[in-house]
């Protein structure tokens, strides 16, 4: 089997003139292409991988939301020579007619990394953007994290920074098939220069309170009380995007082989994230679970 092979990291790495053709190893009978896009309120970028795949032919499309950071994934596996150059690598959704609404700044500034390399997104070197509220979405937190796409034995990753709807999330993430968007949120202007080591303590979690020992009396002493929280408290998100399927056929999981030295594969569903807020609202972060390893 021959497949197109390329890697795109917010550049034109998968443009027609940069794609190569590779011969797959014996026993590999699918070509794969995976595209992941991230949109902040200040812009969007995409990652893409094409190459020899594993598993069965099929197509998968998913929309995810992480505190107002939107992520969209498309996966396609096919069993013909050079069949893996069908997916759009950038958004084609926006109608050119109409003007983008103007939003006044809400007073918060964040570092913004939208398609920047890891080198360009270090510390305080990225550009600073003014956050704003859009419709009933309030963007008063700053985010520092990463997006990772794994397919065809290749893992690509880019940093993500920008304005979000949560000021206190810690090492939070959403996952789709072969895709992860994760990071932490913070409160205050330009607080997102580096949140890699952020701990779970936040103003919303009450501290451990030590009560003084009771005064000695003739009556048997009562048990002293301590208060603590057994788990981090996640603030409730108030809004979610209603991310529509891209294909008229049933959306099934598409299996991808993760890079050998990377994390285990994330296949077919929201593998690593349970939304602990807004249960019953849709879509749940990560979208509906998909059957594992089914063809379309």
């Amino acid at each position: 089997l021959e497949c197109y092979s390329c890697v795109q990291k917010a550049d034109d790495g998968c443009s027609p003139n940069k794609m190569k053709t590779v011969k797959c190893a014996p026993g590999v009978d699918v070509c794969t292409e995976a595209v992941g896009a991230v949109e902040t309120i200040h812009g969007q970028f995409s990652l893409a991988v094409r190459g020899c795949g594993s598993g069965l032919p099929g197509k998968n499309d998913r929309g995810l939301d992480l505190h107002g950071l939107l992520a969209f994934i498309q996966l396609q596996q096919c069993a013909q020579d050079r069949c893996n150059a069908k997916l759009n690598l950038t958004s084609r959704a926006l109608d050119p007619a109409g003007n983008e609404s103007a939003y006044p700044p809400n007073g918060v500034e964040c570092y913004s990394c939208v398609g920047l390399s890891r080198e360009a997104c270090q510390g305080t070197s990225p550009p600073v953007v003014s956050c704003y509220n859009a419709s009933d979405h309030v963007y008063k937190g700053c985010f520092d994290g990463n997006v990772t796409l794994t397919a065809a034995n290749v893992t690509v990753s880019l940093p993500v920074r920008g304005c979000v709807q949560d000021e206190f999330c810690t090492r939070d993430g959403v996952t789709g098939p072969g895709f992860t968007l994760s990071g932490s949120c913070c409160q205050g202007s330009r607080c997102n220069s580096d949140l890699r080591n952020k701990t779970y303590f936040s103003p919303r979690i009450p501290p451990l309170v030590r009560l003084p020992p009771p005064e000695p009396t003739t009556v048997a002493s009562t048990t002293s009380v301590t208060t603590s929280t057994s788990a981090p408290v996640r603030p409730t998100s108030t809004t979610k995007p209603m991310p529509a399927p891209t294909s008229q056929t049933p959306r099934q999981g598409v299996e991808h082989e993760a890079s050998r030295d990377e994390e285990p594969r994330l296949t077919g569903g929201a593998a690593g994230h349970q939304d602990r807020s807004n249960s019953g609202q849709y879509p749940a972060k990560g979208g509906p679970q998909q059957p594992h390893n089914k063809g379309c």
Epitope: S91, P241, P245
Partner: nanobody, 117 residues
Framework: QVQLLESGGGKVQPGGSLRLSCVVS????????MGWYRQTPGKQRELVAH???????NYADSVKGRFTISRDNSKNTLYLQMNSLRAEDTAVYYC???????????WGQGTLVTVSS
């Protein structure tokens, strides 16, 4: 599949108001853009307004300041609040949703808005 059902159309006098609703059902897991379009006889469908998943909105120049698009995710519903209606707003209004990549979109059946004295 995604199904869209509009409601709220009707006849109203110039200067009046109407609120259109569009209930979205089915597999909504990758909807990115939700919008309202309108069409008058013999003309092409034109964008009225759309709203992205992160709340950002776009409006046609002709309705800016008079119409407001919003969405209630808990009710799976898209709205269009139309104020200061004019005769030229008379049209069939269609709800539209599409995915981020633009490779799939769905339309409602339309609801008629008539602005006349």
């Amino acid at each position: 599949q995604v199904q869209l059902l509009e409601s709220g159309g009707g006849k109203v006098q110039p200067g009046g108001s109407l609120r259109l609703s569009c209930v979205v059902s089915g597999d909504t897991s990758s909807i990115y853009l939700m919008g309202w379009y309108r069409q008058t006889p013999g003309k092409q469908r034109e964008l009225v307004a759309h709203i992205r998943g992160n709340g950002r909105t776009n409006y046609a120049d002709s309705v800016k300041g008079r119409f407001t698009i919003s969405r209630d995710n808990s009710k799976n519903t898209l709205y269009l609040q139309m104020n200061s209606l004019r005769a030229e707003d008379t049209a069939v209004y269609y709800c539209n949703v599409r995915n981020f990549w633009g490779s799939a979109e769905y339309w409602g059946q339309g609801t008629l808005v008539t602005v006349s004295s």
